[in-house]
Interface confidence: low
C-alpha cells in the first residue's frame, strides 16, 4: 500500500465475527523469526473517542516538548498487543472477544478477530509485526453493516397469500451474486426460479405460500471483494403444520 | 484516495505575507485523529518543518519560525491553512502540506501523506 | 532544539549494491526517528517509521535500525528505481529533518 493509496476496505457484519486480515510479505530470511515475532494493533474510531485510554497506550509515546502541544490526540489507542512470548496487553480490561490465532502467527498471519463485531468498532485498523531487526505494518478501515430480511406484507400469512421477502444489507454497492435456500432438516436447500418461486435481486417473490411454506428462509449475498453474509427469516403461513 | 493539494500565490513580495491552503479530499479532516502539517524545501536544500495542527485547532509550531507563523483549520472547507508574516528572499521555497500520522506515538509522528507542493517565491 | 547529522551527503552506488545512509541526532530520540525517499521534482515519500517498521508497500530490500541517537537506513540491493534522496526525521521533540542523502550512480 503506497502512501496516499486507498486503505483497503473490510466490511463485517453487527453481531458476526469479523476477521481484519494482515498477512504481510516477511523476507525469507525473517521466516525463522515468526516463532518470536510480536504484533500491535491500534484502532482509529470512526465516530468519538475510545470510552477510556489505558496509561499503557499513553506511555508509548515520546514526551512532548511542551503542555501545548498535548492538543487532544490520540483518538487512536492499542487494541492488543502481543509480546514475543505471547504476552497480551492493550487496552483495558483485555476483552475476549478481541483476537489472534496462535498458531496463524506462527504461520505469519497475524489476523485480528473480533468475535463478535460492534458499531463501536468501525474505524481504521493499522497493525505493525516486530521482527528482531525491523517492523511490517498493515492498514486497513473496517466498516460494519447490518443485515436484515424483511417481509412485505409482514407478520403471518394465511394459506395462498403472496409475499415478498427481500434480503439486504447495509453496503452501498450491490452484491455480485445473491443465492436463495431453505433450511431443513436435511440441511440446505438452494431455491430455484419456479412458479412457485420468482427470484429478482434480493428479492424473491412467492405469489401463493403455502403451510409448506412455514420455516426459515435464508439468503446469502456475496459481493466482489468475497464478503458474504448470511440471512434467515422465518415465515409463518398459518393452517395445517407441514410434515416434519 | 486521501489526496493533499497545496493553493496560493506564487510570488510573494518581501516584508509581506505568504498564504497557503492545504484542501484535503478523501477523508474529513474533523472525523480523524490526525495532524495536519506544513514542511518547506529551499530550491537544493532539505527538508524544513513549519508546524502542524488538529482539526480542533490546536497547533504546535517550529520554534524558529514561531513568531512569523500562524497555521488556521477549516472543517467546514476541509482545509488548513498557512499564513507566515514578514517574508524575505530566504522564504523562497517548495511548500508542502502533509498529514502527520502518530502511529504507535501519542504526541508527534511522520508525514504519511503528502501534497505534491507548491513554489513560493519572494522577490519584489 | 534536537539537530539531525546525515551522512555521507552523497553516496556513489551501482545497481546490486548494499547501500547504508547514517543519521545522528544531538540527542537521545528513542526509536522516534523516519526515513523518506525523495525524488527530483516530487513530494518525499516515507519509508520507515518507528526507526524500523516499513510503511506498507515499501519493498524489503528498505530497513531502518538504531536507537537513541545513532541510526541506519539500509538498502539491501539497490534498485533502479532507488537513486534518489533519503531524509532523516525526528519526532520525539516537535520535528526535525536530516540534510539529506544524494544516492547516485557511479
Known amino acids: 500500500l503506497q502512501p496516499g493509496a486507498e486503505v483497503p476496505v473490510v466490511w463485517a457484519q453487527e453481531g458476526a465475527p469479523a476477521q481484519l486480515p494482515c498477512s504481510p510479505t516477511i523476507p525469507l530470511q525473517d521466516l525463522s523469526l515468526l516463532r518470536r515475532a510480536g504484533v500491535t494493533w491500534q484502532h482509529q474510531p470512526d465516530s468519538g473517542p475510545p470510552a477510556s485510554i489505558p496509561a499503557l497506550d499513553l506511555l508509548q509515546g515520546p514526551h512532548p516538548a511542551a503542555p501545548s502541544s498535548w492538543g487532544p490526540r490520540p483518538r487512536r489507542y492499542t487494541v492488543l498487543s502481543v509480546g514475543p512470548g505471547g504476552l497480551r496487553s492493550g487496552r483495558l480490561p483485555l476483552q475476549p472477544r478481541v483476537q489472534l490465532d496462535e498458531r496463524g502467527r506462527q504461520r505469519g498471519d497475524f489476523s485480528l478477530w473480533l468475535r463478535p463485531a460492534r458499531r463501536a468498532d468501525a474505524g481504521e485498523y493499522r497493525a505493525a509485526v516486530h521482527l528482531r531487526d525491523r517492523a511490517l505494518s498493515c492498514r486497513l478501515r473496517l466498516r460494519l453493516g447490518q443485515a436484515s430480511m424483511t417481509a412485505s406484507p409482514p407478520g403471518s400469512l394465511r394459506a395462498s397469500d403472496w409475499v415478498i421477502l427481500n434480503c439486504s444489507f447495509s453496503r452501498p454497492d450491490r452484491p455480485a451474486s445473491v443465492h436463495w435456500f431453505r433450511n431443513r432438516g436435511q440441511g440446505r436447500v438452494p431455491v430455484r426460479e419456479s412458479p412457485h418461486h420468482h427470484l429478482a435481486e434480493s428479492f424473491l417473490f412467492l405469489p401463493q405460500v403455502s403451510p409448506m411454506d412455514s420455516g426459515p428462509w435464508g439468503c446469502i449475498l456475496t459481493y466482489r471483494d468475497g464478503f458474504n453474509v448470511s440471512i434467515m427469516y422465518n415465515l409463518t403461513v398459518l393452517g395445517l403444520e407441514p410434515p416434519t | 484516495q486521501l489526496q493533499l493539494q497545496e493553493s496560493g500565490p506564487g510570488l510573494v513580495k518581501p516584508s509581506e505575507t505568504l498564504s497557503l491552503t492545504c484542501t484535503v479530499s478523501g477523508d474529513s479532516i474533523s472525523s480523524s485523529s490526525y495532524y495536519w502539517g506544513w514542511i518547506r524545501q529551499p530550491p537544493g536544500k532539505g527538508l524544513e518543518w513549519i508546524g502542524s495542527i488538529f482539526y480542533s485547532g490546536n497547533t504546535y509550531y517550529n520554534p524558529s519560525l514561531k513568531s512569523r507563523v500562524t497555521i488556521s483549520v477549516d472543517t467546514s472547507k476541509n482545509q488548513f491553512s498557512l499564513k507566515l508574516s514578514s517574508v524575505t528572499a530566504a522564504d523562497t521555497a517548495v511548500y508542502y502540506c502533509?498529514?502527520?500520522?502518530?502511529?504507535?506515538?501519542?504526541?508527534?509522528?511522520?508525514?504519511?501523506?503528502w501534497g505534491q507542493g507548491t513554489m513560493v517565491t519572494v522577490s519584489s | 532544539d534536537i539537530q539531525m547529522t546525515q551522512s555521507p551527503s552523497t553516496l556513489s552506488a551501482s545497481v546490486g549494491d548494499r547501500v547504508t545512509i547514517t543519521c545522528r541526532a544531538s540527542q537521545s530520540i528513542s526509536s522516534w526517528l523516519a526515513w523518506y525517499q525523495q525524488k527530483p521534482g516530487k513530494a518525499p515519500k516515507l519509508l520507515i517509521y518507528?526507526?524500523?517498521s516499513s510503511e506498507s508497500g515499501v519493498p524489503s530490500r528498505f530497513s531502518g535500525s538504531g536507537s537513541g541517537t545513532e541510526f541506519t537506513l539500509t538498502i539491501s540491493s539497490l534498485q533502479p528505481d532507488d537513486f534518489a534522496t533519503y531524509y532523516c526525521?525526528?519526532?520525539?521533540?516537535?520535528?526535525?529533518f536530516g540534510g539529506g542523502t544524494k544516492v547516485e550512480i557511479k
Open positions: 502533509a498529514r502527520e500520522d502518530d502511529f504507535l506515538t501519542d504526541y508527534y509522528g511522520a508525514f504519511d501523506i
Open positions: 526525521q525526528q519526532y520525539n521533540s516537535y520535528l526535525t
Open positions: 518507528k526507526a524500523s
